[in-house]
């Protein structure tokens, strides 16, 4: 996991300033308002309700 300004996060993940680590874009299905979701390449799927 990379810090901002160094190499980017691996494919399918994005940097979270809140958590200070790369996070999986897959998590944006359940938590679309997470800070790192803004950095995920594709918009998350339709809103997910549990």
């Amino acid at each position: 996991e990379q810090a901002p300004g160094t190499a980017p996060c691996s494919r399918g993940s994005s940097w979270s300033a809140d958590l200070d680590k790369c996070m999986d874009c897959a998590a944006c299905r359940a938590r679309p308002h997470s800070d790192f979701c803004l950095g995920c390449a594709a918009a998350p799927p339709a809103p997910f309700r549990l």
Epitope: L19, D20, D24, C25, A26, A27, A30, R31, S34, P45
Partner: antibody, heavy 119, light 111 residues
Framework: EVKLQQSGGGLVQPGGSMKLSCVAS????????MNWVRQSPEQGLEWIAE??????????HYAESVKGRFTISRDDSKNSVYLQMNNLRPEDTGIYYC??????????WGQGTTLTVSS | DTVLTQSPASLVVSLGQRATISCRAS??????????IHWYQQKPGQPPKFLIK???NRDSGVPARFSGSGSGTDFTLNIHPVEEDDTAIYYC?????????FGAGTKLELQ
């Protein structure tokens, strides 16, 4: 280092109550959904309760098997999560684990604590 | 609820060989981009240890001998080459909906 330290458990009679506690360290507790998962030879690994975040007024979810009997709560100021278990039944016997997940997988688990419900 | 069916229930493999564990979901647990299946390893007297997320992504520190694949309803955990330390019970878990459920486990033993 992430750590989830559990306490509570033991022997309780059917119909009795027990409270389990779990203290977290090594990660940003307030961002994580906290869970209780139990394990028994009969039921295997069984998710039983989850509590989410303060920003959403701490929504909770329960397995049908414990709904109305168990209550999950958390205290972010103490990095702690609790499970209050009432009206216990013999089938509630098992090892209880606290576990955290950001959204999907349970990446860290407590050491487990044993609950035995028997007369 | 989404039911996860693991097979086989137990597996005996020789050192250095391949262990293949299957997990079948009662409904699709995949979007076009991601599969919401995760794998754990549990050794006697210990809590489960998280191994693989989203069907195929190893957790940090998990050896490359462990690999996951699959989408939709059919998922596989492969361990190759199997080492002595891999003796354990392996579980799959889905996060498609509430409740998140686990498979019944596959016990891996070495010959």
């Amino acid at each position: 280092e992430v750590k989830l330290q559990q306490s509570g458990g033991g022997l309780v009679q059917p119909g009795g109550s027990m409270k389990l506690s779990c203290v977290a360290s090594g990660f940003t507790f307030s961002y994580y959904w906290m869970n209780w998962v139990r394990q028994s030879p009969e039921q295997g690994l069984e998710w039983i309760a989850e509590i989410r975040l303060q920003s959403n007024d701490y929504p909770t979810h329960y397995a049908e098997s414990v709904k109305g009997r168990f209550t999950i709560s958390r205290d972010d100021s103490k990095n702690s999560v609790y499970l209050q278990m009432n009206n216990l039944r013999p089938e509630d016997t098992g090892i209880y684990y606290c576990a955290c997940r950001y959204a999907d997988y349970f990446d860290h688990w407590g050491q487990g604590t044993t609950l035995t419900v028997s007369s | 609820d989404t039911v996860l069916t693991q097979s086989p229930a137990s597996l005996v493999v020789s050192l250095g060989q391949r262990a293949t564990i299957s997990c079948r979901a009662s409904q699709s647990v995949s979007t076009s981009d991601y599969s919401y299946i995760h794998w754990y390893q549990q050794k006697p007297g210990q809590p489960p240890k998280f191994l693989i997320k989203y069907a195929s992504n190893r957790d940090s520190g998990v050896p490359a001998r462990f690999s996951g694949s699959g989408s939709g309803t059919d998922f596989t955990l492969n361990i190759h080459p199997v080492e002595e330390d891999d003796t354990a019970i392996y579980y799959c878990q889905h996060s498609w909906e509430i409740p998140p459920t686990f498979g019944a486990g596959t016990k891996l033993e070495l010959q």
